[in-house]
């Protein structure tokens, strides 16, 4: 019963987490214009992974997609990739875990198969969560780096070189959604892995033997209780792999402002 609950809860938590990862990836508020210590503007800028938006005091919002692929910063591309990998792995994990749920009967699927599927989905959720957390963290690091860069930037306007105050960006709502969602997916994955241990069928190393006493026909069947010693034939190595997700702390030439248009 506890195993079923753990597995079910792991599935639900992961489902919420993956929904959050998808939402964060689609959101436009990955970075928002920093309003602290700045002149109050009648224009508010915010940016996502796929487009940048401008909301005017008039109430109108104009969004422009990043229609270039090669012109975008490598870091942004990396964040996109991490989030997409996280979503794909999470989606596959959800699909696998549906069939692995103890409460769902599919043909004559054995408990060992369900255990393996639960473990597989658990690992997928863990890697998915790590991808989302890594993606959001890389983006946050990029924001922090850009924030402390020089506050003036040069543009070539219609009248030549024009001095303009650089718009500084700070953490947007999507970052917090991404961190929480990644964490939930990770927790859900861990719960699935824990549930897997309880799902695996445990076989005893001894068989029930009938002893026939000369005068009586009483059968002694040792093993009336089952002790989970961990020594049975159930000695599979349940190793959780981190999927090889590594963050390479390379020296990046960051753009002078966090603006990809």
């Amino acid at each position: 019963m506890a195993v079923t609950a753990c597995q079910g809860l792991g599935f639900v938590v992961s489902l919420i987490g993956i929904a959050g990862i998808i939402a964060a990836t689609c959101m436009d508020q990955w970075s928002t214009q920093d309003l602290y210590n700045n002149p109050v503007t009648a224009v508010f800028n915010y940016q996502g992974l796929w487009r940048s938006c401008v909301r005017e005091s008039s109430g109108f919002t104009e969004c422009r997609g990043y229609f270039t692929l090669l012109g975008l910063p490598a870091m942004l591309q990396a964040v996109r990739a991490l989030m997409i990998v996280g979503i794909v792995l999470g989606a596959i994990g959800l699909l696998v875990s549906i069939f692995a749920l103890k409460c769902i009967r599919i043909g004559s699927m054995e408990d060992s198969a369900k255990a393996n599927m639960t473990l597989t989905s658990g690992i997928m959720f863990i890697v998915s969560g790590l991808c989302a957390i890594a993606g959001v963290s890389v983006f946050a690091n990029m924001l922090v780096t850009n924030f402390w860069m020089s506050t003036a930037n040069m543009y070539t306007g219609m009248g030549g070189m024009v001095q303009t105050v650089q718009t500084r960006y700070t953490f947007g709502a999507a970052l917090f959604v991404g961190w929480v969602a990644g964490g939930l997916t990770l927790i859900g994955g861990v719960m699935m892995c824990i549930a897997c241990r309880g799902l695996a069928p445990e076989e005893t190393n001894y068989k029930a033997v009938s002893y026939h006493a000369s005068g009586h026909s009483v059968a002694y069947k040792p093993g009336g209780f089952k002790a989970s010693t961990g020594f049975g034939s159930n000695t599979k190595n349940k190793k959780i792999y981190d999927g090889g997700a590594r963050t390479e702390d390379e020296v990046q030439s960051y753009p002078s402002k966090h603006d990809y248009v």
């Epitope: 224009v43 800028n45 940048s52 008039s58 109430g59 001095q163």
Partner: antibody
Amino acid sequence: QIQLVQSGSELKKPGASVKVSCKASGYTFTNYGINWVRQAPGQGLEWMGWINPNTGETTYAEGFTGRFVLSWDTSVSTAYLQISSLKAEDTAVYFCARLYYGNRFDSWGQGTLVTVSS
Amino acid sequence: DIVMTQSPDSLAVSLGERATINCKSSQSLLNSGNQRNYLAWYQQKPGQPPKLLIYWASTRESGVPDRFSGSGSGTDFTLTISSLQAEDVAVYYCQQAYYYPLTFGGGTKVEIK
């Protein structure tokens, strides 16, 4: 057709109060902000502040806090500018203007002349 | 507050000639998010409310004759009337719509020479 119709001219004594109205028609009133602009006789334009009927937000320019109150009534699609404790220097034409895409004032009221004289 | 400085204060131009009004902002009006300059130009005739001519520094409002054009970016802007007509006699104001409080230039009076 978008129209902003303002109330008629007012002659007031110093210390009195006045309420100028600006009735909007031809568009959904709550969708756009209403700005107020003052023009003293023979002078230029001076932005006073604006109201956003959608969010209930009001923003005032520095010299227009305290005695100046911006309000609105959605049911009659009307914005109001109330000035209390009138002074001689409040004598001016007061315009209302709609804030539109591009943060531009695309439609203006005809203006209301408020004269403060003893 | 952002100071908008217009020049000249007044301008006398012959009919059919070009009229040029300059406007300088104390801070850049270029928004990095959409690469638009939040500057508008208004025309005001005596006894009338101002009329919008140009927004985003160079976009002509619908119904405005094409002899009116706006240019410039950042802090320096220009309104040009390519061929002055009698009905263009008015006071012209530039206005920044980027920072609060929104501010207007002092105005340029255009007359016929």
